[in-house]
Amino acid sequence: KFSKQSWGLENEALIVRCPRQGKPSYTVDWYYSQTNKSIPTQERNRVFASGQLLKFLPAAVADSGIYTCIVRSPTFNRTGYANVTIYKKQSDCNVPDYLMYSTVSGSEKNSKIYCPTIDLYNWTAPLEWFKNCQALQGSRYRAHKSFLVIDNVMTEDAGDYTCKFIHNENGANYSVTATRSFTVKDEQGFSLFPVIGAPAQNEIKEVEIGKNANLTCSACFGKGTQFLAAVLWQLNGTKITDFGEPRIQQEEGQNQSFSNGLACLDMVLRIADVKEEDLLLQYDCLALNLHGLRRHTVRLSRKNPIDHHS
């Protein structure tokens, strides 16, 4: 019951905590279970006991085995077992399952990946992070204290993350690596009253007569997959298809984007060869879903050609 699995790589530091707890002032004795041989407390030894901690500096494959710790409280001798396995370093990039720590899940709101076991070590920044053996670079990744923060998490961020740090013991440095899987979970979706991001209400759009013009209607409807959501343009309160002006067309299909995790739709209105009469029309961007409809109105105004004369 009071047994704990610990693992590490040869030539790296490994520190194991006794699975039985007690106050820092309690004496803790460590033994190598197979031989019942006491683990020394002198720090000059490669493997030594330091209170509730057993330190392998560095670890060797031959250190593998079961270690017994006895916490001597005022009332009881509490016995625990540490099952230690030291593995040879892999030549390739793959981290085998037996070296993986518990999987963590993240989402757009919470994307912290803690470096496993780091609290046992005397480490100093920086903490290095790798994903699938590649060093993480870019502003989306921030190493903060003992964890990695990923901004704007996407499903592609799922994978195996390795943290690497240096443990210092009496001036000597030892490398430590630890790997865990990160999965990205979809946050629960929700729906809200449409929010039109563009155009602004009663916007005046400058156009040049004889040139082409594009108007974009963009709205967001909530988070996750939306059951019913649409954006469209109307001319003088009439659907584009019913208005009967072939120069003015809505872009076929709706472009779905996820801005900041929100489900948003765009619809582009294309006006070819802008004419004077187009300036007299009322252009309505409509966004609708199960909550209702929101309308933003745009009007066109003539853009004065730039006067190049001095």
Epitope: Q21, K23, P74, F76
Partner: antibody, heavy 121, light 106 residues
Framework: QVQLVQSGAEVKKPGASVKVSCKAS????????MYWVRQAPGQGLEWMGA????????AFNQKFKGRVTMTADKSTSTAYMELSSLRSEDTAVYYC??????????????WGQGTMVTVSS | DIQMTQSPSSLSASVGDRVTITCSAS?????MHWYQQKPGKAPKLLIY???KLASGVPSRFSGSGSGTDFTFTISSLQPEDIATYYC?????????FGQGTKLEIK
């Protein structure tokens, strides 16, 4: 939440024995040691002993050694304290108590409601 | 056995007063814990490991000290603080409590 519920009050004659029970809930019974403390009327607190429910190991205040027996039933998450050869000075409220946590096993954060044991001829 | 001597054994103070109780151990201890007990109730842990506030305990309670001399303080006495207070050590067997300090309101 952690709860310790003790058995009801007892009246005993001198020389008899009393067995007080303490049913634990809200945590894994075998993960924490159970301690027994008593308090005579108008007096202070006195530690009697402890049991590790996982192993059955016990530890006692020398004052009570030979007279007190502590046991634990893992199947019902219940600890028992039996005090024999009762005398009038054993009249007290008997408490079972559990430590704050295993890192702070010498401070008692959880207490039973107490069992009044009266020893009278 | 380590003997624990609390002083005073009783004290009377007014609401809002700063109240200090001391506990002296007959030999050096690592930690001191403090409990509050109201009539007919089980003791309640207030301070553990000399100075750490137990969960849900108001911040007006505090503890300090080391070695053989320890102090428990209520920064501003409240009517609900009327109780008996005990110190406790377990650096060596047996675990021992102080004899208690009974606190009353003037």
């Amino acid at each position: 939440q952690v709860q310790l519920v003790q058995s009801g009050a007892e009246v005993k004659k001198p020389g008899a024995s009393v067995k007080v029970s303490c049913k634990a809930s809200g945590y894994t019974f075998t993960d924490s040691e159970m301690y027994w403390v008593r308090q005579a009327p108008g007096q202070g607190l006195e530690w009697m002993g402890a049991i590790d429910p996982e192993t059955g190991d016990t530890a006692f205040n020398q004052k009570f050694k030979g007279r007190v027996t502590m046991t634990a039933d893992k199947s019902t998450s219940t600890a028992y304290m039996e005090l024999s050869s009762l005398r009038s000075e054993d009249t007290a409220v008997y408490y079972c108590t559990r430590a704050f946590d295993n890192d702070n096993d010498d401070a008692f954060a959880y207490w039973g409601q107490g069992t009044m044991v009266t020893v009278s001829s | 056995d380590i003997q624990m001597t609390q002083s005073p054994s009783s004290l009377s103070a007014s609401v809002g007063d700063r109240v200090t109780i001391t506990c002296s151990a007959s030999s050096s201890v690592n930690y001191m814990h403090w409990y509050q007990q109201k009539p007919g109730k089980a003791p309640k842990l207030l301070i553990y490991d000399t100075s750490k506030l137990a969960s849900g305990v108001p911040s007006r309670f505090s503890g300090s000290g080391s070695g053989t001399d320890f102090t428990f303080t209520i920064s501003s006495l409240q009517p609900e603080d009327i109780a008996t207070y005990y110190c406790q050590q377990w650096s060596s067997n047996p675990l021992t409590f102080g004899q208690g300090t009974k606190l009353e309101i003037k």
